[in-house]
């Protein structure tokens, strides 16, 4: 997260760290007791490493009573996701067992009504991604409030030049932005999960290159079918 600040500890109990061989790789969001939603591209970076999900964490390194690392029973990328595009960049991870819920571990309601968030709406994005252009990684969860950007502006040639489909949304990126390592994490508007950070190799913090988020409402049928 660029231009953000440390999150209040455990105030986002849905927040997950998707890890490979014990290292944070991507963000994720607990959407059901045994399921974490993330970005499909995160799996590509995992190679053949052991994928696990950390829940109940604020600090990645310090011991915390609520922290628990779960093995992944099943990884389900969206069937239409492709390495060379950010389309359908969603991944569902089934935990090896149901998460132990509590004040620091709780699923987040996700948007089912397929309607665009009003441009200008302030939404919260959180993650353990880099906090500087130099690539500094935080130990503790960071967050930032970002205004939603209308799709027409996001599709301008100087922004994303027509690449933003109706199944994506954009948020402003003027120094405050999601960045590398935040992919798969949640964009939360009004207490509801609206978007998942896409995992393209986008420049961060440049206002002409807005953050791109996969709209979960557009994938309600797929999410329901996997969780069923």
């Amino acid at each position: 997260i660029l231009g953000g600040r440390e999150a209040e500890a455990h105030a986002r109990p849905y927040m997950a760290s998707v890890q490979v061989n014990g290292e944070h790789l991507c963000g994720g969001v607990l959407v059901a007791e045994q399921w974490v939603l993330s970005a499909a591209h995160c799996l590509e970076d995992a190679a053949d490493g052991k994928v696990q999900v950390l829940l109940g964490a604020h600090s990645l390194s310090q011991p915390e009573p609520s922290k628990r690392l779960y093995d992944v029973l099943r990884a389900v990328p969206h069937p239409d996701s492709r390495p060379d595009t950010i389309d359908h960049d969603l991944l569902l991870l089934q935990l090896s067992e149901k998460a132990t819920l509590g004040p620091a571990v709780r699923p987040l309601p996700w948007q089912r009504v397929d309607r665009d968030v009003e441009p200008g709406t302030l939404c919260d994005v959180a993650g353990w991604g880099i906090v500087s252009h130099a690539g500094r990684r935080p130990d503790r969860l960071q967050h930032v409030l970002l205004p939603v950007l209308d799709r027409a502006t996001c599709n301008r040639r100087t922004h994303h030049d027509g690449a933003i489909t109706q199944r994506m949304m954009c948020a402003e990126s003027n120094r405050r932005d999601s960045c590398k390592g935040d992919s798969g994490g949640p964009l939360v508007c009004g207490g509801v999960l609206e978007g998942v950070v896409t995992s393209g190799s986008r420049v961060c913090g440049n206002r002409k290159k807005p953050g791109i988020y996969t709209r979960v409402a557009s994938y309600a049928a797929w999410i329901d079918s996997v969780l069923a």
Partner: antibody
Framework: EVQLVESGGGLVQPGGSLRLSCAAS????????INWVRQAPGKGLEWIGD????????DYNADFKRRFTFSLDTSKSTAYLQMSSLRAEDTAVYYC?????????WGQGTLVTVSS | DIQLTQSPSSLSASVGDRVTITCRSS???????????LEWYQQKPGKAPNLLIR???NRFSGVPSRFSGSGSGTDFTLTISSLQPEDFATYYC?????????FGQGTKVEIK
């Protein structure tokens, strides 16, 4: 299939007004800016300006700001170019074009002739 | 406003010829985001322009590989490696980096 269709061109007297329409289909109208470009007979392309179909924000080439106005009817997926105080040098084919990707999609153009 | 000057204004060539059109901008057209929004369009008489090249050198989908773009800063080139009968048209460069966006005056490619 993305389509832009202009209409409203024709013969108009100097000092007169005209409203051109650009009807969009095959995509969600509010997802892309509409730009207007004109081309005088035998001449090059000239950018008039653009409009954001969700916010209504506009940007005009300074040469056209006083006499030309953009508007929208999103329920009809249509953009409009209102032209006033027309003069002979405004005689041109007027195009609308969608921005994104680049100017990949254009209308067929509509000819405006300003003459007495 | 940024001026784009194309040369030559017109040229005569034969099928199979290699054709090069240049476009020079009055100032740099590198955008603040680091990208250069220099595009090339082809226009045939009575028709709307067709997008050929985006961001200096990226061919738009469906554009034949004989069309290529290059350049940086203020000097840009469109090359047609082997001119085909359907390539006789007018070509325009365009900059979208700075408002007002502007077109070059055009280069007409005619049959020799």
């Amino acid at each position: 299939e993305v389509q832009l269709v202009e209409s409203g061109g024709g013969l108009v007297q100097p000092g007169g007004s005209l409203r051109l329409s650009c009807a969009a289909s095959g995509y969600t109208f509010t997802d892309y800016y509409i730009n207007w470009v004109r081309q005088a007979p035998g001449k090059g392309l000239e950018w008039i300006g653009d409009i954001n179909p969700i916010t209504g924000d506009t940007d005009y080439n300074a040469d056209f700001k006083r006499r030309f106005t953009f508007s929208l009817d999103t329920s009809k997926s249509t953009a409009y170019l209102q032209m006033s105080s027309l003069r002979a040098e405004d005689t041109a084919v007027y195009y609308c074009t969608r921005e994104g990707p680049s100017f990949a999609y254009w209308g067929q153009g509509t000819l405006v002739t300003v003459s007495s | 406003d940024i001026q784009l000057t194309q040369s030559p204004s017109s040229l005569s060539a034969s099928v199979g010829d290699r054709v090069t059109i240049t476009c020079r901008s009055s100032q740099t057209i590198v955008h603040s985001n680091g990208d250069t929004y220099l595009e090339w369009y082809q226009q045939k008489p009575g028709k709307a322009p067709n997008l050929l090249i985006r961001k200096v050198s990226n061919r738009f989908s469906g554009v034949p590989s004989r069309f290529s773009g290059s350049g940086s800063g203020t000097d840009f080139t469109l090359t047609i490696s082997s001119l085909q009968p359907e390539d006789f048209a007018t070509y325009y460069c365009f900059q979208g980096s700075h408002v007002p966006v502007t077109f070059g005056q055009g280069t007409k490619v005619e049959i020799k």
